[in-house]
Interface confidence: low
């Protein structure tokens, strides 16, 4: 079998064997090595010498195999746009950002660029749980049977109705989607004119 060509090597068809780690240099019609993540091209290749790479300086990065002559500047997550940092910038990876709690991504341009406050879910509903936090605005769904939620909130969850019997009490008023069951003490009989009004 033919020995594997090591960069730099001539390429007549303008393609290189390893597209990820090599690139075609048209001036010399050769294939040269790309620089690995975390580095940049400090000296371009020639017919007799392969690419020379150098490590990215502090506060800069290159994420992929590249033939860039500079590293990208690390950028902070912009709190004005509702973003917060979840992982710092390294020489091989840009700063990782996400939407702040209670916000969702409203604008994407390869990554999230702008977050907005989540909409409130009204009483009797809760936000449908999403696979990934911050990916979309709240979709409010009704509380399931036997549950209630009594606030306007972006994050409140429907809670099960209180079972009066579990507390040694009796039901005075049934729960709804927006209110809990009302319980009363069965041991204290009420005067007829107040029947059903003294609630615990």
């Amino acid at each position: 079998s033919q020995p594997q060509a090591v960069p730099p090597y001539a390429s007549e068809n303008q393609t290189c064997r390893d597209q990820e780690k090599e690139y075609y240099e048209p001036q010399h019609r050769i294939c040269c090595s790309r620089c690995p993540p975390g580095t940049y091209v400090s000296a371009k290749c020639s017919r007799i010498r392969d690419t020379v790479c150098a490590t990215c300086a502090e506060n800069s990065y290159n994420e992929h195999w590249n033939y860039l002559t500079i590293c990208q500047l690390c950028r902070p997550c912009d709190p004005v746009m509702g973003l917060e940092e979840i992982a710092p910038c390294t020489s091989k990876r840009k700063t990782q950002c996400r939407c702040q709690p209670g916000m969702f991504c409203a604008a994407w341009a390869l990554e999230c660029t702008h977050c907005e406050l989540l909409s409130d879910c009204p009483p009797g509903t809760e936000a449908e749980l999403k696979d990934e936090v911050g990916k979309g605005n709240n979709h409010c769904v009704p509380c399931k049977a036997g549950h209630f939620q009594n606030t306007s909130s972006p994050s409140a969850r429907c809670q099960p109705h209180t079972r009066c019997e579990n507390q040694g009490l009796v039901e005075a008023a049934p729960g709804t989607a927006q209110s809990d069951t009302t319980c009363k003490n069965p041991l204290e009989p009420l005067p007829p004119e107040m029947s059903g009004t003294m609630l615990m």
Partner: nanobody, 112 residues
């Protein structure tokens, strides 16, 4: 296009109070959450307070207990009541809808 107009800024002594207003037009006001931001000279713009559609509020630790954000849906206006003002509160104050809309800002100067 949403239009936001801030007003109420001015010069005030330390310990004094101001009430900022943000009048919105071109939007269904009650469907929007609002925030007040500020930008001091040479510093990054920072979020100070937010109010949700239902009136739930959030405050940055630097203003908690001193500033109060509120909204008047019929008037299409968001307010920022600023009490016990300090020199470090000096900045241009902006209101925002969290959808990229900014007003021109109103300058608050706290100085004796």
């Amino acid at each position: 296009e949403v239009q936001l107009v801030e007003s109420g800024g001015g010069l005030v002594q330390p310990g004094g109070s101001l009430r900022l207003s943000c009048k919105a037009s071109g939007t269904t006001f009650s469907d929007r959450a609002f925030g007040w931001y500020r930008q001091a000279p040479g510093k990054q713009r920072e979020l100070v307070a937010t109010i949700s559609t239902a009136g739930l509020t959030w405050y940055d630790v630097s203003v908690k207990g001193r500033f109060i954000i509120s909204r008047d849906n019929p008037e299409n206006t968001v307010y920022l009541q600023m009490n016990s003002l300090r020199p470090e509160d000096t900045a241009v104050y902006y209101c925002n809808t969290f959808r990229g809309n900014w007003g021109q800002g109103t300058l608050v100067t706290v100085s004796s």
